[in-house]
């Protein structure tokens, strides 16, 4: 099929286009090109007769067209009007006609765009800026670039006017950037030159450097001021409110104590009309100043707060030193020094961090020490302790209980009896008590600073008769030759005698037996299996006496070296071998057997029927006590004769 291909399809003004013919039939008489989508003699561009090789211009011929023998048409120096359809009319030798239509589009070659702005010096946080890409061109696409990147997504950036206008609302100093616009159509793309947005801002609050505020007499004072500003700020210095000079730097050589005072830097921006000031207080010491310690928290709470201790004053080129409890700083993950060693931070203070703390400033000749300081760490209250520890009293005596809980500030105490508030004192005194004074005595300690409270409850029994005592033990299953056991006779009662019996006998004299705590506690050191006896304690006073139920001590021991029975070691072939192993142990041990080193069974008895000489060898019994963690074994040789 006859087709027309336009090369290129999109043609720039002034360039050329080739209408290329494909599938041209054979045996042609000639052909003609027409402007438009149909054959119209009034719009003929050119005709061509193959036989004569004669080209004849038509009414639409502009002088820019060239026809080729292969019927292709070249149009040069394209103008906008050339846009549209072109029809090729082919006349074959048999006078049968054939037509094909092609088309192309003409676009202008875009000029280099430029950016116009409605505000050349916008003020930060106040003005908006609208950039417009010039010129306005039909059928062109507009793009924008910021610092050679595509536009960022921002609510302050808005495109309008077919993307030809870029508006920046509420400009900031960060909008100071290189802006470019680009125009594109199908035949060209052009970028503008950069436009730098010049945002006026500031001045910000000036910074005076160095930060050092303490100087020694005779030094030079050289202060520099800087404030972020566009255009650059104009600077003025004031000392104690009096104008000095309009420079960015203030230099005073060989200062004296009289140069102490407030130094103000004023920064002025002539375009924004704004002024900002910063004041620093300079102290000039006649001699090295005595350092002192300041704290960011004068009442830190234990296990909650961190405390930063700072060595004052701050002096340039100075080494700072610290001591705690008259020692150099210990290595601790809770102690941190700042880079310049001037600040010591205690992370998560405890009541043991009170100090004292000292800091020092090292100069060429000596170290100047601060006065020591201590920390007031708030803590507690801990669980209160009620003393004395007696729980049994006889009627008629005075009951005097004292309560104490570690706390800072000191705890405030309250006493409750059977849940009823009695008094707000550290001590509770009741004279001439009776059985009615028996009950639950609660001491409540309150820390007013932290708001925390802790309580301890004590049961007080007032009785003429002593109660039946009981024995408590600190170790219910002691291991032989290793552990000690402390038996305590409960309860603790006032004016009471404590007695002990072992297997119904009074205590034997032994260096391993020790009485303490007013005979209330009986300690057995290095227990042995022979200590596994019945222990009884007794209490008595002038009115009554009572004994506890016996407590039997369960001593863990063994396993001892095992014994294999029967003792025989020679057997006749065909006999039964029946070996039994036994070891003294508490609790009973676990047994296992090995024959010639090969594990057999985990039983106390080893039985082999109808033995032969093949059963000769070493028979080992192993014993293990899981409670004591100890092991033992014995080996026996067995000979079987034929």
């Amino acid at each position: 099929k006859l087709t027309i291909e336009s090369t290129p399809f999109n043609v720039a003004e002034g360039k050329e286009v080739l209408l290329l013919v494909h599938n041209l039939p054979q045996h042609l008489f000639g052909y003609s090109w027409y402007k438009g989508e149909r054959v119209d003699g009034n719009r003929q561009i050119i005709g061509y007769v193959i036989g004569t090789q004669q080209a004849t211009p038509g009414p639409a011929y502009s002088g820019r067209e060239i026809i080729y023998p292969n019927a292709s048409l070249l149009i040069q120096n394209i103008i906008q009007n050339d846009t549209g359809f072109y029809t090729l009319h082919v006349i074959k030798s048999d006078l049968v006609n054939e037509e094909a239509t092609g088309q192309f589009r003409v676009y202008p070659e875009l000029p280099k765009p430029s950016i116009s702005s409605n505000n050349s010096k916008p003020v930060e946080d106040k003005d908006a800026v609208a950039f417009t890409c010039e010129p306005e061109t039909q059928d062109a696409t507009y793009l924008w670039w910021v610092n050679n990147q595509s536009l960022p997504v921002s609510p302050r950036l808005q495109l309008s006017n077919g993307n030809r206008t870029l508006t920046l609302f509420n400009v900031t100093r960060n909008d100071t950037a290189s802006y470019k616009c680009e125009t594109q159509n199908p035949v060209s793309a052009r970028r503008s030159d950069s436009v730098i947005l010049n945002v006026l801002y500031g001045p910000d609050a000036p910074t005076i450097s160095p930060l050092n505020t303490s100087y020694r007499s005779g030094e030079n004072l050289n202060l520099s001021c800087h404030a972020a500003s566009n255009p650059p700020a104009q600077y003025s210095w004031f000392v104690n409110g009096t104008f000095q000079q309009s420079t960015q730097e203030l230099f005073i050589p060989n200062i004296t104590v009289n140069n102490s005072g407030s130094y103000t830097c004023q920064a002025h921006n002539s375009d924004t009309g704004l002024n900002r000031t910063t004041v620093t207080t300079i102290t000039v010491y006649a001699e090295p100043p005595k350092p002192f310690i300041t704290s960011n928290n004068s009442n830190p709470v234990e296990d909650e707060d961190a405390v930063a201790l700072t060595c004052e004053p701050e002096i340039q080129n100075t080494t700072y030193l610290w001591w705690v409890n008259n020692q150099s700083l210990p290595v601790s993950p809770r102690l941190q020094l700042s880079n310049d060693n001037r600040t010591l931070t205690l992370l998560s203070v405890t009541r043991n961090d009170v100090g004292p703390y000292e800091c020092g400033i090292q100069n060429e000749l000596s170290v100047d020490h601060s006065d020591p300081v201590i920390l007031n760490v708030l803590y507690g209250p801990d669980d209160p302790t009620i003393s004395p520890s007696y729980t049994y009293y006889r009627p008629g005596v005075n009951l005097s209980l004292s309560c104490h809980a570690a706390s800072n500030p000191p705890a405030q105490y309250s006493w409750l009896i059977d849940g009823n508030i009695q008094q707000h004192t550290q001590e509770l005194f009741i004279s001439n008590i009776t059985e009615k004074n028996s009950g639950l005595y609660t001491c409540q300690a309150n820390n007013s600073a932290s708001g925390h409270s802790r309580t301890t409850v004590k049961t007080i029994t007032v009785s003429a008769e002593l109660p039946k005592p009981s024995i408590s033990s600190n170790n219910s299953k002691p291991v032989e030759d290793k552990d000690a056991v402390a038996f305590t006779c409960e309860p603790e009662a006032q004016n009471t005698t404590y007695l002990w019996w072992v297997n119904g006998q009074s205590l034997p004299v032994s260096p391993r037996l020790q009485l303490s705590n007013g005979n209330r506690t009986l300690t057995l050191f290095n227990v042995t299996r022979n200590d596994a006896r019945a222990y009884v304690c007794g209490i008595q006073n002038s009115v009554s006496a009572n004994r506890s139920d016996p407590v039997t001590l369960d001593v863990l021991y063994g396993p001892d070296t095992p014994i294999i029975s029967p003792p025989d070691s020679s057997y006749l072939s065909g006999a039964n071998l029946n070996l039994s192993c036994h070891s003294a142990s508490n609790p009973s041990p676990q047994y296992s057997w090995r024959i010639n080193g090969i594990p057999q069974q985990h039983t106390q008895v080893l039985f082999i029927a109808k033995i032969t000489p093949n059963n000769n060898g070493t028979y080992a019994c192993f014993v293990s006590n899981l409670a004591t963690g100890r092991n033992n074994s014995i080996v026996k040789s067995i000979t079987v004769s034929a």
Partner: nanobody
Framework: EVQLVESGGGLVQAGDSLTLTCTSP????????MGWYRQAPGKQRDLVAD?????????NYADFAKGRFTISRDNVKNAVYLQMNNLKPEDTAIYYC????????????WGQGTQVTVSS
Amino acid sequence: EVQLVESGGGLVQAGDSLTLTCTSPTLTFTPYRMGWYRQAPGKQRDLVADISGGDGRTTNYADFAKGRFTISRDNVKNAVYLQMNNLKPEDTAIYYCNTYVAIVGHARSWGQGTQVTVSS
């Protein structure tokens, strides 16, 4: 603010004894080294004796106090004591107690003190 309360002073004869007591409702003395100080009219405040924190096993005395004065502490009662024996007229002064060194972040505040007057 740290509040310190001194008590136990009074007018006594030369050779008599007195026991001064120091407590505080706002500061727990337990961890701190504590001191008794005195200030006679027209003179500066001087350290009389000090006692280490915790169990108070370490004590120090000014020369004039050695052998006559005893400093002690009771952490349960949050109290520091100064037992003064064989008092002399030159012991007449206002007696103060305080932590041995300043507490950081707190102005060094002193209590009212307790007046001790020894007549000959």
